[in-house]
């Protein structure tokens, strides 16, 4: 029996991660990720590290958090490479096609790896109580860990549709996972919900040459609101639209726009046109590089931090022991899994509705023949 992923999540960068509790050897873990359409996950630094930590901290696996758990990741030291005591990764490296990336912002080693220049060694992520990452630990590749982490990379995802009047939201994403909330979804994800009067609705994330969107979704709201206001993507009444400071914290439903008073929604055409052509007050909180994305009405520009790259595994054709697992993105029957992860947008949104990218780059060039970074 091959268990479904316990948890998974995606970020605006297009990277998705899944955490699996299953006792297996390193090679079997690699093969399981490949069969799902991904690869054993790198956990480099920055956003990638935070995404994986969020998955771990979302809850304990089997055993209820009573013991430390070891998860296979794409970290190893090849046979011809030596242990390097002064390096953050101790001579180990991530199996990835990424040409570079900072390794200084990484977890510590739970135990120092054995000094060697001859034997290939793998490494695992040790999690205290199964939820709190303790750090890296050297482990022989043929031994069995308690689980593994997979990574999937997409060019574009679908931001979550706003519920509006919807209830009982359920996200069914491609590689056997099921959730009640997901900020970004890969193509193939199906969202089902109930509208008022228990009317079922279902939309699917589809990708094409233009980008990704929810087909059969009218506007950005799953179920239209009976009134004029939405707060955090859900239907609201005017009295519930004031924040702690007395500011207007709602946005206007389709067909309405912010009135001249700045705190009520009027029929479109009656009030002042709002920024970006949407009915969103200027008090709307912006998404930043460190905060979760608020309900997306301002544009979000995605710029990935260096080091967030998909793994390109060397496929081993000898796999026979693992039953078929639907690939993420395939048209297959999908089953259950718990999922939660806040998206990191890496963008700051200005009051004008335009976006400034948050970019942590370690590379630069003095040559004038370069991308014009002022272009967007």
């Amino acid at each position: 029996e091959h268990p479904t992923a316990d948890r998974a999540g995606c970020s605006a960068s297009g990277a998705c991660y899944s955490l699996h509790h299953a006792t297996m050897k390193r090679q079997a873990a690699e093969e399981a990720c490949i069969l799902r359409g991904g690869a054993l996950s790198t956990v480099r630094a920055g956003a990638e590290l935070r995404a994986v930590l969020a998955l771990l901290r979302a809850g304990p696996g089997p055993g209820g958090g009573s013991k430390d758990l070891l998860f296979w990741v794409a970290l190893e030291r090849r046979r011809s490479h030596c242990t390097l005591e002064n390096e953050p990764l101790r001579g180990f490296s991530w199996l990835s096609s990424d040409p570079g990336g900072l390794e200084s912002d990484t977890l510590q080693w739970v135990e120092e790896p054995q000094r060697s220049c001859t034997a290939r060694r793998c490494a695992v992520l040790q999690a205290t109580g199964g939820v709190e990452p303790a750090g890296w630990k050297e482990m022989r590749c043929h031994l069995r860990a308690n689980g593994y982490l997979c990574k999937y990379q997409f060019e574009v995802l679908c931001p979550a549709p706003r519920p509006g009047a919807a209830s009982n939201l359920s996200y069914r994403a491609p590689f056997q996972l099921h959730s009640a909330a997901l900020d970004f979804s890969p193509p193939g994800t199906e969202v089902s919900a109930l509208c008022r009067g228990q009317l079922p609705i279902s939309v699917t994330c589809i990708a094409d040459e233009i980008g990704a969107r929810w087909d059969k979704l009218s506007g950005d709201v799953l179920c239209p609101c009976p009134g004029r206001y939405l707060r955090a993507g859900k239907c609201a009444e005017l009295p519930n639209c004031l924040d702690d400071l007395g500011g207007f914290a709602c946005e206007c439903a389709t067909g309405f726009e912010l009135g001249k008073d700045g705190r009520s929604c009027v029929t479109s055409g009656e009030g002042q046109p709002t920024l970006g052509g949407t009915g969103v007050p200027t008090r709307r909180p912006p998404a930043t590089a460190t905060s979760p994305v608020p309900q997306r009405t301002w544009p979000i520009r995605v710029d990935e931090k260096l080091g967030e790259t998909p793994l390109v595994p060397e496929q081993d054709n000898s796999v026979t022991s693992i039953p078929e697992i639907p690939r993420w993105g395939s048209q297959s029957t999908m089953s259950t899994l718990q999922m939660s992860l806040q998206a990191e947008s890496k963008a700051t949104i200005t009051p004008s509705g335009s976006v400034i990218s948050k970019f942590n780059s370690t590379t630069s060039s003095a040559t004038p023949q370069a991308f014009d970074s002022s272009s967007a």
């Epitope: 960068s13 096609s97 931001p159 040459e209 969107r213 967030e308 780059s361 590379t363 991308f371």
Partner: antibody
Amino acid sequence: EVQGVESGGGLVQPKGSLKLSCAASGFTFNTYAMHWVCQAPGKGLEWVARIRSKSNNYATYYADSVKDRFTISRDDSQSMLYLQMNNLKTEDTAMYYCVREGVYYYGSSGYYAMDYWGQGTSVTVSS
Amino acid sequence: EIVLTQSPAIMSASPGEKVTITCSASSSVSYMHWFQQKPGTSPKLWIYSTSNLASGVPARFSGSGSGTSYSLTISRMEAEDAATYYCQQRSSYPLTFGAGTKLELK
């Protein structure tokens, strides 16, 4: 800083070949689709080719005018984009730009857009 | 292929004047992107997906349209807006650009 440095342009005779390169940096190259777009002297922009990322199996697309003559490729390990140009014609004379295909999220949709352009490399096809 | 026809081809505007550039598609397209290019420089993404301003683009710019008819509008012309503007569709291959509208300062 997002950057792309094009090279490989120059003067070539009709029916000749040329290989353009674009060295990208400042972003995770292997997760983005990339394009080549050209601009003939004093003319408008013309899309040439597109190559998608590994997650989309490096799918390639070409303008009809360059099909079977030009080949777009990439080397993710080196963050390099290439355009192999064979059987060149005088009408291929242009500035060639290496362009990143960014992703923008707005509302509940994600959109592709050519968001970063290199400074270009000039190709002249003349006898 | 989808042909994009921009009009006017060349126009001049005085500072403070309202400017509208149109882009007509030979077949219906889902969205339109707009690029700005100044002499001797690379094009810059200016408006994406019909109406969203790229980062750093002044709020006096706006985009609108649907189907086969799209437009870029500058509410009040400024000297720095003098440039050539191109529309682009990506609803179908080949991806196509309009021939451009050269906007000059009067």
